[in-house]
């Protein structure tokens, strides 16, 4: 081909000559290529139009391609560029106009590129500039230069990585003469020790984030106090979990932070053993988004009801026990992938709508009720990746939930009465994996509003599907896989006029029968892929419902012989509903084994006596 | 509107088990909650005995642990407590409550007085 | 366990006086600290939860303040039918325990 020997990713569009060992810009891609890899090449040298072939270039990928020059208007003929990386490019001499012609560029990755200063970069131009990554250099200086205030339209600057040591009130001048509330500013890794007091005195960020700047916990509450007057969306602290400097945490750490505006706080890989947070965490009580990630905390009782925060959100944190959570304002808790607390102990959260309890690990002595959550406005519910989840309540004031999730928990006494009788509202139910063995007709009543049910991995009585699905004639997606199904009612879809995706999957099926699916007329995709089908289980096989789309029949146990001839035609028949044909093998006899079902020809011969 | 009430005797004997009932209306106890007994010693303070939870889980304070017991019965959708071996100093009123979900309760029985005496 | 000691044990008080009852935690509870009112022959009612908020119903001359280990109840302009005794309960951690109690009379 033309473009070889670059993969064609998308025709005429998408070209990747990744690692080809090419000196120069091939030539035999086609003009209206958008997107072009050609990183890892040793290029070396790019001279003036070097990309004059590739008008319609939006994303151009120079990565570690040894370049060592930019000349004038390289890129000149880029204007519809958007995205240009040139990560991991010693890069000794960038020309003046190096950058000239791309009136489009948005995202400019100059990370690893040796640059020592912002102040020479010559990037004053690109005035559609929204994000500038220039982490892991030699930068020293955290002077913004003039030129900043044309780049009206930066969101993102990452200075990562860099060597950036004092902060000073000259550095940030240009951001006064500009309305950049939008800027998000990351700063991690820097080795940061002095914040001059004012530097960020009236300054708007949407985002700015420090972790792992800071060589001691003095160092950090100095830096701290230097942000005083910043106006900040969402300020990231902490530190990496390979890059950890700061020991332990006191209580007056983040005292500097009483001297921001922040919106949404959000501290990470830190060891916390105090034995008071809510001292810690003071000068935080009214942001609206507070989060803690990969933090070990000795005691969370100390939340106070006070606090404001309207998301709070706590994921791969240590415990001692389940903390206790009362909090007036909050609406939306992630509480996830935490350790420590096996036991999950009631929360008082009178105005969450949202929460997000999975891998955990948690065992749950009763649920659900509102008197768990301490809330009758709750939409949300995941309590998947847990322990033992005792169902001992049929969700006595949460009627307004919408989405349940106990995938991969292990629920108990969930065939004993109606558990979701009273969630008329709910759209989602997910009980994958979760132990159940259905032996009670009424499990789902009062589902009347679901469209997802997921329920992959249980058993039933007998391996036998009754007619549990009554209630659910909203229901659009049905996934019964690994079930150890061996037959079903043939009344047990009657009421799914909505049904567009049954999964049937990994069961133990030995035939297949049309019948069930007679009353699905918006059925498009039954998967009946991985179980042991072999024929059907009556003479006259119907047609599935006309709106099927894809039929899966794979990995199947096919008996390719004469007694099984009308089944055969009629898998034959529907070849165009079929989903990976060519696996769809014979089972037996023995001497067709493997043989791909539809390229079989069976001509069988009646006896005549 | 959750109410509790709560019955039984009013005279044990020393070393006999109290055994007193809660009646609930206005709410299933098998529902959601944790229901609890709470007593006041004639003139004195008020001390927690101990609950069960919705799920028919329970727990008590460990300075009654080895003494009392607290069962339910959903059907009648009321809790029982029970405490054995009692001497005088089991002379009070007898509350039932309703916890919240916070550790406080919004809810009382209007309390049973029951005297340990011979 | 944690011990709550309350102060004063009793209290005469005139009518439009201002109430104040403290209650002292044996540890750090936060806000995790409710206040009840019990009238003689009657059951307790909780007035206050977690140290300062107000129960819906109850007159707004009763507030609440304090955090950690220290708080506080007061009764802004006592009126006759406040005289109760007074309990506060902590809710940090299990046994749940109550104060010993403060008698508030009408002089």
């Known amino acids: 081909e033309s473009w070889e020997p670059c993969v064609e990713v998308v025709p005429n569009i998408t070209y990747q000559c990744m690692e080809l060992k090419f000196y120069k810009i091939p030539d035999n891609i086609p003009f209206s290529t958008k997107n072009l890899d050609l990183s890892f090449n040793p290029l070396r040298h790019l001279g003036s139009y070097s990309f004059l072939r590739f008008p319609e270039l939006q994303v151009l990928d120079l990565s570690r391609c040894e370049i060592q020059t930019i000349e004038d208007g390289a890129y000149q003929s880029l204007s519809h560029l958007s995205t240009l990386i040139l990560t991991g490019n010693p890069i000794q001499s960038l020309a003046l106009g190096a950058f000239s012609g791309l009136s489009s560029l948005q995202k400019l990755v100059a990370v690893e590129t040796n640059l020592a200063s912002l102040e020479n970069f010559p990037i004053g131009h690109l005035k559609t500039l929204k994000e500038l990554n220039v982490a892991h250099n030699l930068i020293q200086s955290f002077k913004l230069p003039e030129y900043f205030s044309n780049l009206t339209n930066l969101e993102h600057l990452d200075l990562s990585s860099n060597k950036i040591q004092n902060i000073y009130c000259k550095d940030l001048q240009v951001l006064h003469q500009m309305p950049l509330s939008n800027l998000s500013l990351d700063l991690s890794l820097n080795p940061i020790n002095f914040i001059q007091p004012g530097a960020f005195k009236e300054i708007r960020l949407h985002k700015l984030t420090l972790r792992s700047n800071f060589d001691d916990l003095n160092v950090m509450k100095t830096c701290i106090q230097g942000l005083a007057g910043l106006e900040v969306h969402r300020l990231v602290l902490g530190e990496f979990r390979n890059e950890r400097n700061l020991e332990e945490f006191d209580k007056s750490s983040l005292e500097g932070l009483c001297n921001l505006t922040i919106e949404e706080f959000r501290l990470t890989y830190l060891d916390c053993y105090l034995d008071n947070i809510i001292d810690l965490f003071n000068c935080l009580a009214n942001v609206s988004s507070f989060s803690l990630v990969s933090v070990n905390i000795k005691r969370v009782e100390d939340f106070s009801y006070n606090f404001r925060w309207q998301h709070l959100e706590l994921v791969n944190c240590k415990f001692e026990q389940f903390p206790t959570l009362e909090l007036k304002s909050l609406k939306r808790l992630t509480f996830t992938a935490n350790k420590g607390g096996n036991a999950f102990s009631e929360v008082d959260l009178p105005s969450l709508e949202f929460l997000d309890l999975s891998r955990n690990g948690l065992s749950f002595k009763g649920c659900c009720s509102q008197s768990d959550f301490g809330t009758t406005s709750l939409k949300y519910l995941d309590l998947s990746f847990n322990d033992v989840i005792t169902m001992s309540s049929n969700f006595l004031g949460l009627e307004q939930l919408e989405h349940l999730d106990f995938q991969h928990s292990n629920l108990k006494q969930m065939s004993q009465f109606s558990v979701f009788l009273s969630l008329r509202n709910l759209i989602y139910l997910d009980i994958s994996h979760t132990h159940t063995r259905v032996a009670f007709n009424g499990i789902f009543d009062g589902l009347l509003s679901l469209k997802v049910l997921k329920m992959a991995g249980n058993s039933f009585q007998e391996n036998f599907l009754p007619d549990i699905f009554t209630d659910l004639k909203n229901l659009t997606f049905l996934d019964l896989s690994q079930c150890q199904l061996e037959q079903l009612s043939p009344t047990a879809f009657d009421t799914l006029n909505k049904l567009q995706v049954l999964n049937m999957s990994h069961n133990n099926f030995f035939s297949l029968d049309t019948f069930p699916y007679k009353c699905l007329p918006s059925l498009q995709v039954l998967d009946y892929s991985l179980n042991h089908i072999m024929t059907s289980n009556n003479q006259e096989l119907q047609h599935f419902p006309s709106s099927l789309a894809f039929l899966n029949l794979t990995q199947n146990d096919f008996a390719c012989t004469c007694e099984h001839q009308s089944f055969l035609q009629w898998i034959k028949d529907q070849r165009q509903l079929l989903v990976e044909a060519e696996r769809m093998e014979c089972a037996t006899p023995s001497d067709k084994q493997g043989m791909p079902v539809l390229s079989l020809n069976i001509t069988c011969q009646m006896n005549k006596t | 509107q959750v109410q509790l009430q709560e019955s039984g005797p009013g005279l044990v004997k020393p070393s006999d088990t109290l055994s007193l009932t809660c009646a609930v209306s206005?709410?299933?106890?098998?529902?959601?909650?944790?229901w609890h007994w709470i007593r006041q010693p004639p003139g004195k303070g008020l001390e927690w005995m101990g609950y069960i939870h919705y799920s028919g889980y329970t727990d008590f304070n460990p300075s009654l642990k080895t003494r009392i017991t607290i069962s339910r019965d959903t059907s009648k959708n009321q809790f029982s407590l029970k405490l054995s071996s009692v001497t005088a100093v089991d002379t009070a009123v007898y509350y039932c409550?309703?916890?919240?979900?916070?550790?406080?309760?919004?809810?009382w029985g209007q309390g049973t007085l029951v005297t340990v005496s011979s | 366990e944690i011990v709550l000691t309350q102060s004063p044990d009793f209290q005469s008080v005139t009518p439009k006086e201002k109430v104040t009852i403290t209650c002292r935690a044996s540890q750090s509870i936060s806000d995790h600290l409710h206040w009840y009112q019990q009238k003689p022959d009657q059951s307790p009612k909780l007035l206050i939860k977690?140290?300062?908020h107000a129960i819906s119903g109850v007159p707004s001359r009763f507030s609440g303040s304090g955090s950690g280990t220290d708080f506080t109840l007061t009764i802004n302009s006592l009126e006759a039918e406040d005289a109760a005794t007074y309990y506060c309960q902590q809710g940090h951690s299990f046994p749940l325990t109550f104060g010993g109690g403060t008698k508030v009379e009408i002089k």
């Open positions: 206005g709410y299933p106890i098998g529902g959601g909650y944790s």
């Open positions: 409550a309703r916890k919240d979900s916070g550790n406080y309760f919004p809810y």
């Open positions: 977690y140290a300062s």
